[in-house]
């Protein structure tokens, strides 16, 4: 389980000619609100197909009205961030539909009046748990600027939030059967937790405080049986007498959905599914014509002059779709050699070489050891990208030009006196204490502390260890 | 700690029938599920059929529903695979899985339930 949030930066006229008409004017006052939708994989789904890993609707923006003759500024935006919990696994790689939806202030008869200002697409490749990642997206001449990240909701961990995790309660290792949470050391796997009561024979559960019910059981402890027999409708809460579900209200009834959408409950609301042609929250948004921008990414909008013609979307390089929605993900060729870091930077590839590589595709290998000295008789070793020297005995640092003195850390404990060696160090140990560094005691009665002896020499024997 | 011995298994012709047993010993395992799970080679291992002991609930995956039958005879301590109409991609190695404390964390086809295993039994169709 987790949280994917969204951050927008901007909203307003992208760079080039051609700039926007500002969305309010002096007699039509309206703010902005956004609408994010996820779905999992990288999708070849149309924009109406459901979010099937979430949505979200921002809160509203400021007010903001048009100064006349001034050109369309970024736009006042909400606060806070757009955050789409996930119940499940998040996937790794995603498509995402953000919408900017403009709510005219006027004196609309029945309340104010939605329309869809811009919506931009990607698909993406995001680990749960890493930093925020930053991303531009044009809409016709309008620019979104956001970040985007996906967190782990606790105990949950892991670049997928799959693996559960709590805090270790002893030092030294788990508990039966519990393995140590790499990467984070002081935490242990945590066995997986229903919700408390939930029936061990008709419930179950995949994340932490839930309680699922096998078919033909429900309530909130998968303790009722359904009856189907005389049951008039298979949705709302149980009736603790029958074991039926009686109807209750949802969020599809009367169907809110305009122009033949069809409507499917979500956790939280409900999510529209619109016929070709129609798009927004409830299907409400239609004719699309070149004017209303329906190209993304800088795409060039040909024909559709009017409502009933179709436009077509010619796509920079980098995109594709039928608005240039979709990012063609030119790094999965994994063009860059030698574990270069591919960038597709949308009008060009770009290889990020590692240390010790060159090359449009990182596919030089550079002579690392070239021009590089390793003083005092110390040899030069190649690999990886980089040089090191192995140096000569007595030597150290990166380029063997320091005078290694093994005696400087002071090794020998107890008072024990250190003596450089063309082997390296040798402890001369204080009466009563033996061992390579003298921290064993000689115990007086001839045994001393040491956990076992090596092999060929007891305890007691008053020898040093080298 | 608990021993799970599964028996049964054989090579038989499409269309044929087989038994497997799972005998659990030192333990009388009376309640939480027990289950039967396969995995052919180069495969990933999958929930065959489940049964709740101490209750009344059976599960099988759909692709043995309707062929496969699950039991248990509580005085044996044993569980049992009915396994009938048998088909070619039925062949693999199958595992008997126990549960000996009822919980409700996963599904009881999913093999993070369990946590004891027998060591499988070889079930080849083959004409």
């Known amino acids: 389980a987790g949280v994917f949030e969204l951050q927008i930066h901007s909203f307003g006229p992208g760079p080039g000619p051609g700039a926007p008409r500002s969305p309010c004017s002096a007699r039509l006052p309206c703010r902005l609100f956004f609408r994010v939708c996820l779905k999992p994989g990288l999708s070849e789904e149309a924009a109406e197909s459901p979010c099937a890993l979430g949505a979200a609707l921002s809160a509203r923006g400021p007010v903001y009205t048009e100064q006349p003759g001034a050109p369309a500024p970024d736009l006042p935006l909400p606060d806070g961030l757009l955050q789409v919990p996930f119940r499940d696994a998040w996937p790794g790689t995603f498509s995402f539909i953000i919408e900017t939806w403009r709510e005219e202030l006027g004196d609309q008869i029945g309340g104010p009046a939605w329309s869809l200002l811009a919506r931009v697409a990607g698909r993406r490749r995001l680990a749960a748990g890493g930093p925020w990642a930053r991303d531009i997206q044009r809409a016709g001449a309008w620019e979104l600027r956001f970040s985007y990240r996906a967190r782990c909701e606790p105990p949950a961990v892991g670049t997928a939030c799959t693996r559960l995790c709590r805090p270790r309660s002893a030092p030294s290792r788990c508990g039966p059967g519990l393995r140590p949470c790499a990467p984070l050391e002081d935490e242990c796997e945590a066995p997986l937790v229903c919700r408390a009561g939930c029936s061990p024979e008709h419930g179950f559960c995949e994340q932490p405080g839930e309680c699922r019910c096998l078919e033909g059981w429900t309530g909130p402890l998968c303790t009722v049986p359904v009856s189907t027999s005389s049951c008039l409708s298979p949705r709302g809460p149980s009736s603790a007498t029958t074991g039926c579900l009686v109807p209750g209200p949802g969020p599809c009834d009367g169907n809110p959905c305009a122009n033949g959408g069809s409507c499917s409950e979500t956790p939280r609301s409900f999510e529209c599914t619109c016929p070709r042609g129609f798009y927004g929250l409830r299907c409400e948004v239609s004719g699309v014509t070149c004017a209303d921008g329906p190209c993304f990414n800088g795409g060039l909008c040909v024909g559709g002059a009017d409502p009933d013609s179709a436009y077509i979307c010619h796509c920079p390089p980098g995109f594709q779709g039928s608005n240039c929605e979709k990012r063609v993900d030119r790094c999965s060729l994994q063009p860059c050699r030698n574990g270069g870091l591919c960038l597709d930077l949308g009008h060009a590839l770009r290889c990020r070489c590692r240390a010790g590589f060159a090359g449009p595709r990182c596919e030089h290998d550079l002579d690392d050891c070239a021009g590089r000295a390793c003083a005092n008789g110390g040899t030069c070793v190649e690999g990886g990208g980089a040089h090191r020297c192995s140096c000569a005995l007595g030597f150290g640092g990166r380029d063997c030009r320091e005078r290694a003195d093994p005696c400087a850390a002071r090794p020998c404990a107890h008072g024990g006196r250190c003596y450089a060696h063309f082997s390296g160090l040798v402890c001369a140990c204080a009466p009563g204490y033996m061992g390579a560094r003298c921290e064993f005691p000689v115990h007086p009665d001839g045994a001393s502390a040491l956990p076992a002896a090596p092999p060929g020499l007891r305890p007691g024997d008053p020898q040093r260890y080298l | 700690e608990v021993q799970l011995v599964e028996s049964g298994g054989g090579l038989v012709q499409p269309g044929g029938s087989l038994r497997l047993s799972c005998a659990a010993s030192t333990y009388t395992i009376s309640s939480g599920y027990m289950g039967w799970f396969r995995q052919a080679p180069g495969k990933e291992r999958e929930g065959v059929a489940a049964?709740?002991?101490?209750?009344?609930?059976?599960l099988y995956a759909d692709s043995v529903k309707g062929r496969f039958t699950i039991s248990r005879d509580n005085s044996k301590n044993t569980l049992y695979l009915q396994m009938n109409s048998l088909r070619a991609e039925d062949t693999a190695v199958y595992y008997c899985?126990?549960?000996?404390?009822?919980?409700?964390?996963?599904?009881?086809?999913?093999?993070?339930?369990?946590?004891?295993w027998g060591q499988g039994t070889l079930v080849t169709v083959s004409s």
């Open positions: 049964i709740y002991i101490g209750g009344s609930t059976t």
């Open positions: 899985a126990a549960q000996l404390r009822p919980n409700s964390a996963y599904h009881p086809l999913d093999g993070r339930k369990y946590n004891y």
